[in-house]
Amino acid sequence: APTSSSTKKTQLQLEHLLLDLQMILNGINNYKNPKLTRMLTFKFYMPKKATELRHLQCLEEELKPLEEVLNLAQSKSFHLRDTKDLISNINVIVLELKGSETTLMCEYADETATIVEFLNRWITFCQSIISTLT
């Protein structure tokens, strides 16, 4: 059974993941972002099911494409400081949260998604899991 300190750590990590994903989404949705139309042409794989921490495997597998799209999109009005560091930070959190005991084969949905839909899906995942922690 999870201890209160391990639950607290999980909560913190999920909150940090939530903030980082929302920061990216806010940057993309910024009305001054001239690359938004182009960014929306890139397709991301969505998880068929994302209800447990181990399903973060599906997010981990899409972090490289996410980094590539964000790098392509950098401009004066859309600037995420140190995209590499940001994705690396997200990766560290994801690895800790999902654990390494069991390697899950990620099951993806048939339909791909835009970067906005992709980020919203994982933001909702974080919100949902945080809300169940006691």
């Epitope: 909150e15 939530l18 920061m23 140190d82 560091d85 940001l86 930070n89 949902s128 945080i130 809300s131």
Partner: antibody, heavy 115, light 107 residues
């Protein structure tokens, strides 16, 4: 015990900048994001943004974008919030608060902007 | 941004009274809502996190409930030291937002 201790009150002229510090103790500084919240006299609370003390990554509320800069010095467990091009309506108490649930707050720093 | 509508904006009650404050979010925020009390001239203090979890050291007369868009904060028996302004705050979406506050006074 966890403590967030902020720098003292400041009086600034319109157009100037102010830098408020928040020294953390009693916990691992790099393990928790630090948020900044302000409160104008007699008003409610307004979130300004956050910094990840580990990476230095920041995210600012749209309202303050371009005017606010959040930094940190991990060697002294201190977060900083600098607000530039000050106006009279920036007169407020500025608070640092720890992580998403704001479980610990600094005592507040009154910044008065007046000509 | 998510709007939080807090009511009432102020109330006056007697010692021992049950006091209820509500907070309505403009969209679903799960249970990602916190409650704070701010005494005059002081920083806010966290009382309840994630809608219904009492922060360590907070008296059991304080409680919170709700999820989705409707939330309630209750003081079961008002004490003189409970005066101050109470704020709800959502931690579901950026920008983080606060309710307008409820000023609680003793009759």
């Amino acid at each position: 015990q966890v403590q967030l201790v902020q720098s003292g009150a400041e009086v600034k002229k319109p157009g100037a900048s102010v830098k408020v510090s928040c020294k953390a103790s009693g916990y691992t500084f790099t393990g928790y994001y630090m948020h900044w919240v302000r409160q104008a006299p007699g008003q409610g609370l307004e979130w300004m943004g956050w910094i990840n003390p580990n990476s230095g990554g920041t995210n600012y509320a749209q309202k303050f974008q371009g005017r606010v800069t959040m930094t940190r010095d991990t060697s002294i467990s201190t977060a900083y919030m600098e607000l530039s091009r000050l106006r009279s309506d920036d007169t407020a108490v500025y608070y640092c608060a720890r992580d998403l649930t704001f479980d610990y707050w600094g005592q507040g720093t009154l910044v008065t902007v007046s000509s | 941004a998510i709007q939080l509508t807090q009511s009432p904006s102020s109330l006056s009650a007697s010692v021992g009274d049950r006091v209820t404050i509500t907070c309505q979010a403009s969209q679903d925020i799960f249970n990602l809502l916190n409650w704070y009390r701010q005494k005059p001239g002081k920083a806010p203090d966290l009382l309840v996190y994630r809608a219904s979890n009492l922060e360590t050291g907070v008296p059991s007369r304080f409680s919170g409930s709700g999820s989705g868009t409707d939330f309630t904060f209750t003081i079961s028996s008002l004490q003189p030291e409970d005066v101050g302004t109470y704020y709800c705050q959502q931690s579901a979406n950026l920008p983080l937002t606060f309710g307008g506050g409820t000023k609680v006074e003793i009759k």
